[in-house]
Amino acid sequence: VPRWRQQWSGPGTTKRFPETVLARCVKYTEIHPEMRHVDCQSVWDAFKGAFISKHPCNITEEDYQPLMKLGTQTVPCNKILLWSRIKDLAHQFTQVQRDMFTLEDTLLGYLADDLTWCGEFNTSKINYQSCPDWRKDCSNNPVSVFWKTVSRRFAEAACDVVHVMLNGSRSKIFDKNSTFGSVEVHNLQPEKVQTLEAWVIHGGREDSRDLCQDPTIKELESIISKRNIQFSCKNIYRPDKFLQCVKNPEDSSCTSEI
């Protein structure tokens, strides 16, 4: 008897998902000697165990705890860069500024970046056809719960000055519904974090507005201030020049505002 397979609204598990996770794990432990102790087979088993045979709308943070434990990693708590809707530039930045870290520079973030996955209730199959969409189907799906879990832990680990890169080209520069707005902001620890510094990245070359005065940035400032964390904001008018100056700080053109 052919089994009825749930059709979800989102794309299915990324092709070659297990092989990709394994290859990334091996690569990461090669590049980061401090993580050489990690057993990638155990990591895969824990990752798989979080969602296989479970209803893909019924995933909990608890499901990911074995994986979280295996992926425990110490990053310098004062070198954390959060981002919202501007992942590529954030990653380009930490590739140059090697002492700063986004979530995707940690093992667990690196493993899952840009991947989709889900299983099916009561079968050991991975569903490559479709997975739940956060809006159209359910929020407690394997991918969303994973990022909520790792994002919360990442924010909780932060200390001193925490930086966040925000996309100034979007209608909501700060979006309360983003992972940054709904998870990370609320899990920064006021007893450890002194300041949240927002970097608002401008899109247009001729855009000279002070986007730090944007209503959504003021909303972010209000939320942060109520949590007894100081807030500061900088406009990054020229992201290309900004990156160039991170690479070559001595360049004479890097003394002016970017």
């Epitope: 297990p18 394994l22 290859a23 794990c25 091996v26 690569k27 057993d39 990638c40 088993d45 199959k125």
Partner: antibody
């Protein structure tokens, strides 16, 4: 051109540990980008993947053999090794070492294979 | 019993096209590789990542993979192609790489 050569005893007693070494020449294990694997073939039968190791020491084993398998690497000697414990007659096979890409399955260089017989 | 199913044998006349199939659950979502093994010799990689040929492998060998079936096609089959052929791919249920049971290709004549 990369060459692989298996070595080790051709006869192992039941319940003992099978130990094989694969010497790699014509390329460095430490250069990265490849998994170093063990694969076996029972007499007159198909192939069975046993497991791999990366030069950094990261391993992945066939889950059905995992409890008995250990693969290790010695980058200074440019070789990797297989240990299979508690062997039975069912472990009698030709054992191959091979080099594979990081997505697995694509073993582009193989040793000539060594027959290991498990018998008392 | 392998989770990747291959026909035990396939026969073809010289110059004709031989097709060897490899079937498994969600196979199209994983890379498939193919090996040729002549009697008494080590296997040789003839196809990787579904459709790519290593250097030195003639272009009469081609591959495809979609749905639950991968196919190795040998066009203009020659007597030297007589050998065992194995597919290999990741298997989700076993969480490891598995080989098909193998197909013995016989070139008639």
């Amino acid at each position: 051109k990369v060459q692989l050569q298996e070595s080790g005893p051709g006869l192992v007693k039941p319940s003992q540990t099978l130990s094989l070494t694969c010497a790699v020449s014509g390329g460095s294990i430490s250069s990265g980008g490849y998994y170093w694997s063990w694969i076996r073939q029972h007499p007159g039968k198909g192939l069975e993947w046993i497991g791999y190791i990366y030069y950094s020491g990261s391993t992945y084993y066939n889950p059905s053999l995992k409890s008995r398998v250990t693969i290790s690497v010695d980058t200074s000697k440019n070789q990797f090794s297989l240990k299979l414990s508690s062997v039975t007659a069912a472990d009698t096979a030709v054992y191959y070492c091979a080099r594979g890409g990081v997505m697995g399955g694509d073993f582009d260089y193989w040793g000539q294979g060594t027959l290991v017989t498990v018998s008392s | 019993q392998s989770v990747l199913t291959q026909p035990p044998s396939v026969s073809v006349s010289p110059g004709q096209t031989a097709s060897i199939t490899c079937s498994g659950d969600n196979l199209g979502d994983h890379y498939v590789c193919w090996y040729q093994q002549r009697p008494g010799q080590s296997p040789v990689l003839i196809m990787y990542e579904d459709t790519k040929r290593p250097s030195g492998i003639p272009d009469r060998f081609s591959g495809s993979n979609s749905g639950n079936t991968a196919t190795l096609t040998i066009s203009g089959t020659q007597t030297m192609d007589e050998a065992d052929y194995y597919c290999v791919a990741w298997d989700d249920s076993l969480s490891g790489w598995v080989f098909g049971g193998g197909t013995q290709l016989t070139v008639l004549g």
